[in-house]
């Protein structure tokens, strides 16, 4: 063997190196890689160092046998059968309530005859649930609602005003609140005369009797 | 008649183990998973996790982690919940329930109590 | 964790008298489920899904709110009423009960 270059170095089971046929000298780059559904363990770069001797060990390749973490999922919950994913092992996700599940609940991960195991499915996704809407409320007599719907989506607000000659008793403006079931905030209002209203709060009426035989009232004031 | 049977009470060592046991009966135990609540003396609650009978899955609160170990056998259809390195703070009543969202059904409650 | 406030924290109550007591939550959720539970006695799931009766629960009860704000109402407290009552939630992991509310007869 020459003095003046590094060893030669192997191929390894279920990998190959690169470049194939290195030159030996000092500085020389070697890396192994394995083939699908193989890993490598130890390092996979090797250098020829000064003294002639490799920077590590030889490593090897071994066979992979479990799935990757497919990772949390907002909104949700999950259930980990084992937790380095091994063959067989299942993921369960239960999205927080007021979401809904869109995709697999459950995942299952799956040996392949060529290739690392994979999960039966990509993980789900939750998203909101959709608030009901409110029911749309009668305009109040003498007056009228605005928007005129018959269903306000959650979150959305009604303004209520009242036809001239009426005035307001109530809530001019109500809101739906989001829920479940979504409801409004207040009672719709009603629409009141105004000049009922103003007469009766501010005056008391005395009637006058006029006499049998007469035609003249005599008012009392 | 849904029912959760629960083992009796636990005198333990601090630094010791102990293992509870959950018995289900009145309905199909693989339909629905099994939690475990804490509950300390007159205080509120706490959820340490759960379990997927069919599955065996698992699902912990953070807190509880590495503290509690829960398991199923499907042929005889009970839940168990392990504590391990108990110290005085374990001591507690601990509920098996059944539940997704909301907890339907409540064991009798073990009490644990971890004195020297 | 979302955190729940409930106050209460200890109430009495005249038996006829209507009760209200309110379970407030650090960040909005979806639904909030209620549980009495009495002296020596597990919880009892009580009111679910926010406003739902569970099967056995007297009409008397209700309960509503919406994103941080709920509450349970009796509307004519009796006897057998004098319980504590817990919040829950599970609009977000891991699933959190309220601080208790204890009812007492007066």
């Known amino acids: 063997p020459r003095n003046d270059t590094c060893p030669e170095l192997p191929e390894i089971p279920n990998g190959w190196k690169s470049p194939s046929q290195p030159e030996l000298v000092h500085g020389t780059v070697v890396t192994y890689q394995c083939y699908p559904g193989y890993q490598v363990v130890g390092s996979s770069v090797l250098m020829c160092q000064w003294d002639l001797t490799w920077s590590e060990d030889l490593p090897s390749c071994q066979r992979v046998t479990s799935c990757h973490d497919p990772g949390d999922v907002e909104h949700s919950r999950r259930l980990i059968s084992s937790p380095k994913f091994p063959v067989g092992a299942t993921v369960q996700y239960i999205c927080d309530q007021g979401f809904v599940l869109m995709g697999s609940s459950i995942l299952t991960c799956h040996d392949r005859q060529a290739g690392s195991p994979k999960w039966s499915d990509r993980a789900p996704k939750c998203l909101l649930e959709q608030l009901k809407p409110c029911h749309g409320l009668s305009a109040p007599e003498n007056g009228a609602r605005s928007p005129e719907k018959q269903l306000h989506p959650a979150g959305a607000t009604i303004h209520f005003s009242c036809a001239p000659g009426y005035v307001l008793k109530g809530q001019a403006s109500i809101k739906c609140v989001p829920g479940h079931p979504s409801h409004w905030s207040d009672p719709p209002p009603i629409c009141r005369a105004a000049s009922l209203d103003g007469f009766y709060n501010s005056r008391s009426l005395d009637v006058a009797k006029a006499p049998a035989a007469s035609s003249t009232l005599d008012a009392a004031h | 008649e849904v029912q959760l049977q629960q083992s009796g009470p636990e005198l333990m060592k601090p630094g010791a183990s102990v293992k509870m046991s959950c018995k289900a009966s009145?309905?199909?135990?693989?339909?629905?998973?099994i939690h475990w609540v804490k509950q300390h003396q007159g205080k509120s609650l706490e959820w340490i996790g759960e379990i997927n009978p069919n599955t065996g899955g698992t699902g912990y609160n953070q807190k509880f982690q590495g503290k509690a170990t829960m398991t199923v056998d499907k042929s005889s259809s009970t839940a168990y919940m392990e504590l391990r390195s108990l110290t005085s703070e374990d001591s507690a009543v601990y509920y098996c329930?059944?539940?997704?969202?909301?907890?339907?059904?409540w064991g009798q409650g073990t009490t644990l109590t971890v004195s020297s | 964790q979302i955190v729940l406030t409930q106050s209460p924290a200890i109430m009495s109550a005249s038996p006829g008298e209507k009760v209200t007591m309110t379970c407030s939550a650090s960040?909005?959720?979806?639904?909030m489920h209620w549980y009495q539970q009495k002296s020596g006695t597990s919880p009892k799931r009580w009111i679910y899904d926010t406003s739902k009766l569970a099967s056995g629960v007297p009409a008397r009860f209700s309960g509503s709110g919406s994103g941080t704000s709920y509450s349970l109402t009796i509307s004519s407290m009796e006897t057998e009423d004098a319980a504590t009552y817990y919040c829950q939630q599970w609009s977000n992991t891991p699933p959190t009960f309220g601080s208790v509310t204890k009812l007492e007869i007066k």
């Open positions: 009145g309905y199909t135990f693989t339909d629905h998973n």
């Open positions: 329930v059944r539940g997704l969202y909301f907890f339907d059904y």
């Open positions: 960040s909005s959720v979806s639904y």
